[in-house]
């Protein structure tokens, strides 16, 4: 019967005994750096060209005993879960395979910097469909590995890396922390993130999305039909480069933008067991299992949406963080989120041409995240409208006035370290959807864009009593692009998106007192695009 | 019930050519391999190749590179054996058999097909 | 190419009697990745396709009677038949399924004494 692992990425309307997606991906090329493979096995031979490079350290002890079975054995699994006749994902992809890691499994930064330009080159010489490059490998943090797969990215090329097997943070390996790379950490059969001994799946911010990556049935380099069970975050991101083969094969024009934001969409929601990270690590790993999609076609009319988290400011006074889009994306919202809840705010401001967004700390804080809402928004004009603090007693506010333009998301900042302490709520005059609210002492920031289309709505959700979170979520055909809080709330510790839904957190409700000041409404602002479902129809 | 059924015994001139085939059925032929087997008269079992009509994948024995093709049409599940010049050596009874990729030994085989081959 | 060896050529047993076929592959078939022997036993009558008997060196296919069983590991395995019936009259075959080419042994006749 049907692996567990392909079952669990594949769409109920495609289940079935055996595992037979409608596109085998086959207009796409993977480049795989891994170790040496076995490529006469027969679930990939015919499948995988064994490429000229090699470029590995040498094995470490004196004893070591090279056999080429265990030299294959990484490599040859990873490329059977790709496009593997039996057990693959892309059973349609070719692949071209690089030797990048010794047989130990070790590798350098050197080694893959000049297996990256070797695909950069072929791709020059030989330009053809689009491609995907799979590294599944993971080493200390790395500005120059970093900076050439942000190379590669730029010049159209996927790439897909393992998070790393370190049980830590994601951002502390490379190629895991470069943000153009999809980083892909290991989820298990019951979709609980991926124990290997003492250790497990990396997380945190750096993460993509998770994919699964335990007892993973794959070609092994034994024997020509040997197959066996292998695991870790290298599996996870094999079949997130088989999905992306699917779907570049299906839609050969996808960006990486619009290819990340399919995955993330695609992907199987708040599945995953987030005890399992720690604390501080769950609001900031996505709770997101990748699949395929449904439908290989016809997803083009969605706006889509996902949340970038920053890094952590510090802690210092003046300190900030900064949460960018990719390159094709437009920032829609920014928001921000301190675990201690002093912080004073945030606002998108214009960096290199284009638009961020950044949190402010507060004297005593321990730091705070900026969140930056991106999505994808062809056509789109984008601008954000500042009012500084007002002088009366009703509040800051301001609103979208050019003609066409919608609210996309409201932030507020503000210098005073204390605000919103012992004052009573702002409420927001109904009737004014295109307005963004705040306290006097505030400046409020709001995204208003003009896009072919675009309709926006604003959605709250208020609870009289002090809750530890409120959530707002958009409706079906709808998407989240902004989430607030409404000010006069001093306790809130921030807003941030998660999927669909707007979260708001506040303190612990025990250390709050029950007064008027517990309220706490969650806004969220829900888009969609007329013109997007008008063009899909059409192409259709 | 899961089954290969094989098309009728020939009887051929050397230097003919000839297509003998195997229908599967009961089972989703695109994903089990179809290996063709030759015995020849008071003999033993020769495995000459295998195909994987998922992408038409094949592998061939050395012993038969170039001596036979095999090929299969998955829209009607069958796959098939043939020789563009037959030659005397070629009087045989040939079987095809099923494979699974995580069973890589033969569990369901065709009744067999005899080829004769006589001026 | 990996060679299997059967010995006997031929046996004759009594009714009720306990056969046994020997077969060597002169390379090992057995894995470390999952521990698996690549070997399987089938048996054919006269003027019939072969069935199979044994995957794995020592798993019986279902259906199959328990008299049949299998042993051995690596190099060399063993197919006993505890107690011989009239109908086990057959030849038997080993068959490497882990590199190719695939190959069997040439054989073991198996006729009642």
């Known amino acids: 019967s049907i692996p567990w692992n392909l079952e669990r990425i594949t769409p109920p309307r495609y289940r079935a005994d055996e595992y037979q997606p409608p596109d085998g991906g086959s207009l796409v090329e993977v480049y795989l750096l891994d170790t040496s493979i076995q490529s006469d096995h027969r679930e990939i031979e015919g499948r995988v060209m064994v490429t000229d490079f090699e470029n590995v350290p040498e094995e470490d002890g004196t004893r070591f005993h090279r056999q080429a079975s265990k030299c294959d054995s990484h490599g040859t699994h990873l490329a059977g879960v790709v496009s593997g006749r039996d057990a693959g994902v892309a059973k349609g992809a070719s692949m071209r395979s690089l030797r990048v890691l010794n047989c130990q499994g070790k590798g350098t930064v050197s080694g893959t910097l000049i297996g990256l330009e070797f695909i950069r080159k072929s791709q020059l010489v030989q330009p053809v469909g689009p491609l995907v490059v799979l590294l599944p490998l993971a080493g200390g943090y790395s500005r120059v590995l970093n900076a050439a797969c942000q190379r590669l990215a730029r010049a159209g090329v996927v790439l897909v890396t393992a998070a790393g097997n370190f049980r830590d943070d994601a951002c502390l390996y490379s190629p895991a922390s470069a943000p153009e790379v999809i980083t892909v950490g290991a989820t298990n059969a019951q979709d609980q993130p991926v124990t290997l001994g003492t250790l497990g799946t990396n997380f945190g911010r750096c993460v993509d999305l998770f994919a699964p990556g335990e007892d993973i049935i794959g070609a092994s380099s034994d024997c020509s039909t040997c197959f066996v069970s292998q695991s870790g975050t290298s599996q996870a991101a094999a079949h997130v480069a088989g999905i992306a083969a699917m779907m570049l094969s299906a839609e050969p024009e996808l960006t990486l933008a619009e290819l990340r934001q399919r995955l993330i969409h695609f992907s199987a929601k708040d599945v995953i067991n987030e005890a399992w990270f720690p604390e501080d690590q769950r609001v900031l790993t996505p709770n997101l299992v990748a699949a395929l999609p449904p439908s290989t076609h016809g997803a083009g009319w969605q706006l889509f949406c996902r949340t970038v988290w920053s890094a952590h400011s510090g802690p210092t006074r003046m300190a900030t963080a900064v949460a960018r889009c990719a390159p094709d994306e437009e920032l829609l919202s920014c928001s921000s989120f301190s675990r201690s809840g002093k912080r004073r705010g945030e606002r998108m401001e214009a960096q290199g041409g284009k638009l961020v967004c950044r949190a402010h700390n507060a004297f005593g804080g321990e730091g705070v995240y900026a969140i930056a809402r991106c999505c994808l928004l062809p056509q789109a004009n984008c601008s954000v409208h500042t009012a500084p603090p007002a002088e009366a007693s009703m509040g800051t506010r301001v609103h979208c006035h050019q003609q066409g333009h919608v609210l996309t998301g409201c932030s507020s900042h503000w210098e005073v370290e204390d605000l919103g302490t012992h004052k009573p709520p702002v409420l927001r005059p109904r009737g004014q959807p295109n307005q963004c609210v705040g306290h006097r002492e505030a400046s409020i920031h709001a995204s208003c864009c003009h896009a072919p289309g675009l309709e926006c709505k604003v959605k709250e959700h208020g609870i009289p009593a002090p809750q530890e979170q409120v959530t707002v979520a958009c409706e079906e055909g709808w998407t989240l692009t902004g989430c607030s809080a409404l000010p006069g709330t001093s306790h809130v510790l921030g807003a941030y998106a998660v999927d669909n839904t707007c979260v708001v957190r506040s303190r612990d409700v025990s250390t709050t007192g029950s007064t008027s000041e517990g309220a706490v409404t969650a806004v969220a602002i829900c888009c969609r695009s007329r013109h997007l479902a008008q063009a899909s129809q059409e192409l259709q | 019930q899961v089954q290969l059924v094989q098309s009728g015994a020939e009887v051929k001139k050397p230097g003919e050519s000839l297509k003998i085939s195997c229908k599967g059925s009961g089972y989703s032929f695109t994903n089990y391999y179809i290996s063709w087997v030759r015995q020849m008269p008071g003999k033993g079992l020769e495995w000459m190749g295998l195909?994987?009509?998922?992408?038409?994948?094949?592998h061939y024995n050395p012993s038969f590179q170039g001596q036979v093709t095999i090929s299969a049409d998955k829209s009607i599940s069958t796959a098939y054996l043939q020789w563009s010049s037959l030659k005397a050596s070629d009087t045989a009874m040939y079987y095809c058999?099923?494979?699974?990729?995580?069973?890589?030994?033969?569990?369901?085989w065709g009744q067999g097909t005899l080829v004769t081959v006589s001026s | 190419d990996i060679v299997m060896t059967q010995s006997p050529d031929s046996l004759a047993v009594s009714l009720g009697e306990r056969a046994t076929i020997n077969c060597r592959s002169s390379?090992?078939?057995?894995?470390?990745?999952?521990?698996?022997?690549?070997l399987a036993w089938y048996q054919q009558k006269p003027g019939q396709p072969p069935k199979l008997l044994i995957y794995w060196a020592s798993t019986r296919e279902s259906g199959v009677p328990d008299r049949f069983s299998g042993s051995g590991s690596g190099t060399d395995f063993t197919l006993t038949i505890s107690s011989l019936q009239a109908e086990d009259v057959a030849v038997y075959y080993c068959q490497q399924y882990s590199s190719f080419p695939i190959t069997f042994g040439q054989g073991t006749k198996v006729e009642i004494k």
């Open positions: 195909i994987y009509p998922g992408d038409s994948y094949t």
């Open positions: 390379q090992s078939v057995l894995y470390s990745s999952n521990n698996k022997n690549y």
């Open positions: 058999a099923r494979d699974h990729w995580y069973k890589p030994f033969s569990d369901i």
